[in-house]
Interface confidence: low
């Protein structure tokens, strides 16, 4: 589409007479009628076929035509056209004597010509006007002309469409050749693609307008480039989206089972030894004056049994005090005053002399202890016993009495709970301090997984485009990490419109 | 298992500023996957969504209460705040705090709801 | 901002009947982003349905989710005594998020 422009400059009719030779009367007030039509050889009459227009009267026999085009008038003359401009023309210029105002061709006579003109040739769209004068016998034109391309239109035939546009469907500016020069931050062929943020991950973002980088599911941060672990990861971290690799000392499926219970939260009050055992399992050795599976019952000093010799201890405010049977004495009742004379050693114990006589010692047979063999051995002082287990006499020999879920001699061992196999379907048992936690396969659920459900969400393939599947072990479902150019729940859409809420 | 309790008084004053907490366990907020909303719904109608606060906090508002609205977040103490000032009897409501995952703004969990009454 | 128009306002249906509930956008919801709650009285809506047809977990399979563009629908093949209650659609493809005004479905 363009426009084929018509410049009228001076039209001289010195002596004012029409074509016919006769004279206009008063004088030849004189108008222009214009025909443009396709390349011919010879201009013969026929239809307009690029168009035709007229002029008012512009001036009487002599005159020059004023550039009207800035005041919105008539010159230069404009004839229209939508099609692709073919590069050649025929044009026709008839000066007319118009004696009244009616100018239509019926109204006027037939010898009311003045002059006629026709021209033919190549003509190529540009700025540049092309100056021409054509002279008869009796008058002379003066008129320059040009094809320029209508606003939007562009290239040597106005045959490219091409109109600057900032909005969905494109943001670009038209060169002078017609083809687009996208606006900064745009790329594309129709600079529908926004630049995103410099460094936003090319897999992970996307953008919907520039500088822009918006994470795709299972992705955060300013580019993009860091994973989100799993829903209700605790202490873990990830290399792809809803991962949960564990940090040191975390174990179970959402890193959230303490395998260091004992650095992570010292249990053990008193000053007391934390021993880790496990899941989320410890064992404190207690000082002495304590007891307790944490350690944090205090003892009263008397039960450590601190009197020797057959003491009896007594509470004081301010600690214990030992009441010495006779012939002993001293804080703990741990000196004598007897010696072998006076058959110090009870149960069978043998007396041996010391410090020339000043002082003796008993030595005592099996099962009995004391300084004087007093006391039946106690096999449980040693507190041997580990993981809370009660230790309980035995004549001779002691036995420990395990808390549920320890066995040994000293229930030092730990019973699994997953020694009987209890998860169905093929799933993973995890011993646990109060017992035990299956993690199921695919397709299975429960606390023992022997309930079936739902497949793995990803086995059905329901991402397009060679898109990733992630299955969303929380909520049972999957997510599809699309591939550069795809949008959707499953990457099924192409990339089109941006989306509206860029979120 | 995630939940989410809202606490706050449950009478405000109009011309006073309304101020709720969501206190959320069983799951962390500091989560970057997770975007954490209030909601509303007047007596006997429908629900609004008010806005949400992400634990970067980045905050997006409903555009009609915009002008009145804070919301914000301390990840350590696993809560998340709404402020609502200048209030009407128009926001006589009950307020709901809830989950939704990032980029996809659906509610999978959401607070058991407190009312809030404006009268004087 | 995206306008939600669910209908009937209300349903008066029977144990075992079949319900369908329609979700009317005054725009295209992209990329299908509609969820549904089902809400019963004095508790929070729980979500059913995302991204128009995806089941929430834990949610029964009579309950179906369908449509996109501005249709949409929540079909209840048969249903049960528990079900009875209003339900609600919620776009979030389009800013400020926005739900429907509700259906509820009572027994007949």
């Known amino acids: 589409s363009g426009v084929f422009q018509l410049q009228l400059q001076e039209f001289i009719n010195e002596r004012g007479v029409l074509a016919s030779g006769r004279p206009c009367e008063p004088g030849c007030r004189t108008f222009f009628r214009v025909c443009l039509k396709h390349f011919q050889a010879v201009v013969s009459p026929g239809p307009c076929t690029f168009g035709t227009v007229s002029t008012p009267v512009l001036g009487t026999n002599s005159f020059a035509v004023r550039d009207d085009s800035s005041g919105g008038g008539r010159n230069p003359l404009q004839l229209p056209f939508n099609f692709t401009w073919p590069g050649t023309f025929s044009l026709i210029i008839e000066a007319w004597h118009a004696p009244g105002d009616d100018l239509r061709p019926e109204a006027l006579p037939p010898d009311a010509l003045i002059s006629k003109i026709a021209i033919q040739g190549s003509l190529a769209v540009g700025q540049n006007w092309l100056l021409d004068e054509q002279t008869s016998t009796l008058t002379r034109l003066r008129y320059s002309y040009r094809v320029i391309c209508s606003d939007n239109y562009y290239g040597d035939n106005c045959s490219r469409l091409c109109k600057k546009r900032n909005d969905h469907f494109g943001h670009y500016v038209c060169q002078p050749d017609g083809n687009l020069s996208c606006l900064p931050g745009w790329t594309g062929e129709y600079c529908q693609q926004p630049i995103c943020l410099s460094g936003c991950h090319e897999q992970n973002g996307y953008c919907s307008k520039p500088a822009e980088c918006l994470c795709r599911p299972g992705w955060q941060g300013r580019l993009c480039n860091e994973c989100i672990p799993h829903n209700g990861c605790r202490h873990g971290t990830c290399s792809t989206p809803w991962q949960c690799t564990c940090d040191e000392g975390w174990g179970g499926l959402f890193c959230d089972q303490d395998l260091n219970y004992c650095t992570h939260h010292s249990p053990c009050k008193n000053g007391a030894t934390c021993s880790n055992s496990g899941q989320r399992s410890y064992t404190c050795t207690c000082r002495p004056g304590y007891t307790g599976v944490d350690c944090e019952l205090e003892l009263s000093e008397c039960d450590s049994n601190p009197c020797r010799n057959g003491g009896s201890c007594k509470d004081q405010e301010d600690g214990y005090h030992c009441l010495c049977p006779p012939g002993y004495y001293g804080l703990h009742c741990e000196h004598s005053t007897l010696s072998c004379a006076d058959s110090p050693c009870f149960n069978g114990g043998s007396c041996r002399e010391r410090n020339q006589g000043a002082n003796y010692a008993c030595e005592c047979p099996p099962n009995f202890t004391g300084s004087n063999c007093e006391k039946k051995v106690d096999r449980c002082t040693s507190n041997p016993c580990a993981n809370g287990g009660q230790c309980l006499n035995r004549g001779p020999s002691r036995m420990c009495r395990c808390r549920p879920g320890f066995t040994g001699t000293y229930c030092e061992l730990h019973v699994s709970d997953c020694a009987r196999n209890p998860c169905a379907h093929g799933g993973t048992c995890h011993d646990l301090e109060n017992g035990l936690m299956c993690t199921c396969p695919a397709g299975f659920s429960g606390r023992r997984c022997e309930v079936r459900t739902s497949i793995d969400a990803c086995a059905s393939s329901p991402c397009f485009n060679r898109a990733t599947c992630y299955t969303d072990l929380s909520t049972d479902t999957f997510v599809c990490n699309c591939p550069y150019g795809f949008v959707g729940s499953r990457c099924e859409f192409p990339v089109g419109l941006p989306p509206s809420f860029p979120w | 298992q995630v939940q989410l309790q809202e606490s706050g008084p449950g009478l405000v004053k109009p011309s006073q500023t309304l101020s709720l907490t969501c206190t959320v366990s069983g799951g962390s907020i500091g989560s970057g996957g997770y975007y954490w909303s209030w909601i509303r719904q007047h007596p006997g109608k429908g629900l609004e969504w008010i806005g949400y606060?992400?634990?970067?906090?980045?905050?997006h508002y409903n555009p009609s209460l915009k002008s009145r609205l804070s919301i914000s977040i301390d990840t350590s103490k696993i809560q998340f705040s709404l402020k609502l000032s200048s209030v009407t009897a128009a926001d006589t409501a009950v307020y709901y705090c809830a989950r939704a995952p990032r980029g996809y703004h659906y509610f999978a969990y959401w607070g058991q709801g407190t009312l809030v009454t404006v009268s004087s | 901002e995206i306008v939600l128009t669910q209908s009937p306002g209300t349903l008066s249906l029977s144990p075992g009947e079949r319900a369908t509930l329609s979700c009317r956008a005054s725009?295209?919801?992209?990329?299908?982003?509609l969820a549904w709650y089902q809400q019963k009285p004095g508790q929070a809506p729980r979500l059913l349905i995302f991204?128009?047809?995806s089941r929430a977990t834990g949610i029964p399979d009579r309950f179906s989710g369908s449509g996109s563009g501005t249709d949409f629908t929540l079909t209840i093949s048969r249903l049960e005594p528990e079900d009875f209650a209003v339900y609600y659609c919620q776009q979030y493809g389009s800013s400020p998020l926005t739900f429907g005004g509700g259906t509820k479905v009572e027994i007949k």
């Open positions: 991204g128009a047809s």
């Open positions: 606060v992400h634990y970067s906090g980045n905050t």
């Open positions: 725009q295209s919801v992209s990329s299908s982003y």
